[in-house]
């Protein structure tokens, strides 16, 4: 596709989320870059409101699950790469996120090119969340879990969705379960990929900056696409 | 071509009410959040209110909490600042603005919007 030309080296990125959680209003900007030839994100994110009220890892798949554009897709599964042939005009990106035995994230982002860099814009309203449970009572250990992203091609409305579920590690040894629904639709008009059916792999690391001052997130993140074995072309030539 | 059009300002005296109207010429409305914003002489714009496109989240900013309040109306494309107990520092032109970021928290936080209106003259005396 066209969009995937745009990613062949290394890409600058951009994040801001504005946030309402049960109230709690926050920001989030984010600064970093990815590079699709290995599937690869390094971001740095503040609150740049003071103290984020919910916990890091509960933001991840909104931040950076949020730019699947820079997902590695194996030269015979080029044909399923929605995200990147959505670009430069990009997509939009809505989820709910329903928190086992609490609240529910809904999300909006869009998710585009803007000169050179890859902006990823979100709004996220929170509620129902219990004001001791695992997410405001702030219970949930700071690091992430592997996951699989389940994608599929919705042709009525020319694009994709996606079915997942994260587990987020809690202080006690047990898991908080988040089950997310996502779907993405072009924002502009030009033909983009609608794939079969597979899946992205997904790695990421969460660290802290000892020099950084502000409530924050340095992420390294690892993401493939996989599910799709090659065809019987491909075996033979 | 999108407009916003504001009416319903004017000069009033402290303890007064006025309604202010936004009338969007937008074919999705329904799914734009909505706000009120406010500039007086030689000073930022600033968001007074924000309703989210379905009008289940509304915002407002803490000088104006209890006095003003948003509403929509999305058969009729129009949104609405009911202003009671008006004071001379409400003294303004009042904007209104749209987003395509449905919560209304961009256009809150970030002043940032898709459509901004000319803006109508809100005069209170003391």
């Known amino acids: 596709s066209k969009g995937e030309e745009l990613f062949t080296g290394v890409v600058p990125i951009l994040v801001e989320l504005d946030g309402d959680v049960n109230g709690h209003k926050f920001s989030v900007s984010g600064e970093g870059e990815g590079d699709a030839t290995y599937g690869k994100l390094t971001l740095k994110f503040i609150c740049t409101t003071g103290k984020l009220p919910v916990p890091w890892p509960t933001l991840v798949t909104t931040l950076t699950y949020g730019v699947q554009c820079f997902s590695r897709y194996p030269d015979h599964m080029k044909r399923h790469d929605f995200f990147k042939s959505a670009m430069p005009e990009g997509y939009v990106q809505e989820r709910t996120i329903s928190f086992k035995d609490d609240g529910n994230y809904k999300t909006r982002a869009e998710v585009k090119f803007e000169g050179d860099t890859l902006v990823n814009r979100i709004e996220l309203k929170g509620i129902d969340f219990k004001e001791d449970g695992n997410i405001l009572g702030h219970k949930l250990e700071y690091n992430y879990n592997s996951h699989n992203v389940y994608i599929t091609a919705d042709k009525q409305k020319n694009g994709i969705k996606a079915n997942f579920k994260i587990r987020h590690n809690i202080e006690d040894g047990s898991v908080q379960l988040a089950d997310h629904y996502q779907q993405n639709t072009p924002i502009g008009d030009g033909p983009v990929l609608l794939p079969d059916n597979h899946y992205l792999s997904t790695q990421s690391a969460l660290s802290k900056d000892p020099n950084e001052k502000r409530d924050h997130m340095v992420l390294l993140e690892f993401v493939t696409a996989a599910g799709i074995t090659h065809g019987m072309d491909e075996l033979y030539k | 071509q999108v407009q916003l059009v504001e009416s319903g300002g004017g000069l009033v005296q402290t303890g007064d009410s006025l309604r202010l109207s936004c009338a969007a010429s937008?074919?999705?409305?329904?799914?734009?959040?909505m706000g009120w914003f406010r500039q007086a002489p030689g000073k930022e714009r600033e968001a007074v209110a924000t309703i989210s496109a379905e009008g289940d989240s509304t915002y407002y900013d803490d000088s104006v909490k209890g006095r003003f309040t948003i509403s929509r109306d999305n058969a009729a494309n129009t949104v609405y600042l009911q202003m009671n107990s008006l004071k001379p520092e409400d003294t303004a032109v009042y904007y209104c603005a749209a987003s395509r970021f449905p919560y209304g928290l961009r256009l809150l936080q970030r002043r940032e919007s898709d459509y901004w209106g000319q803006g109508t003259q809100v005069t209170v005396s003391s």
């Open positions: 937008l074919r999705t409305f329904k799914s734009y959040a």
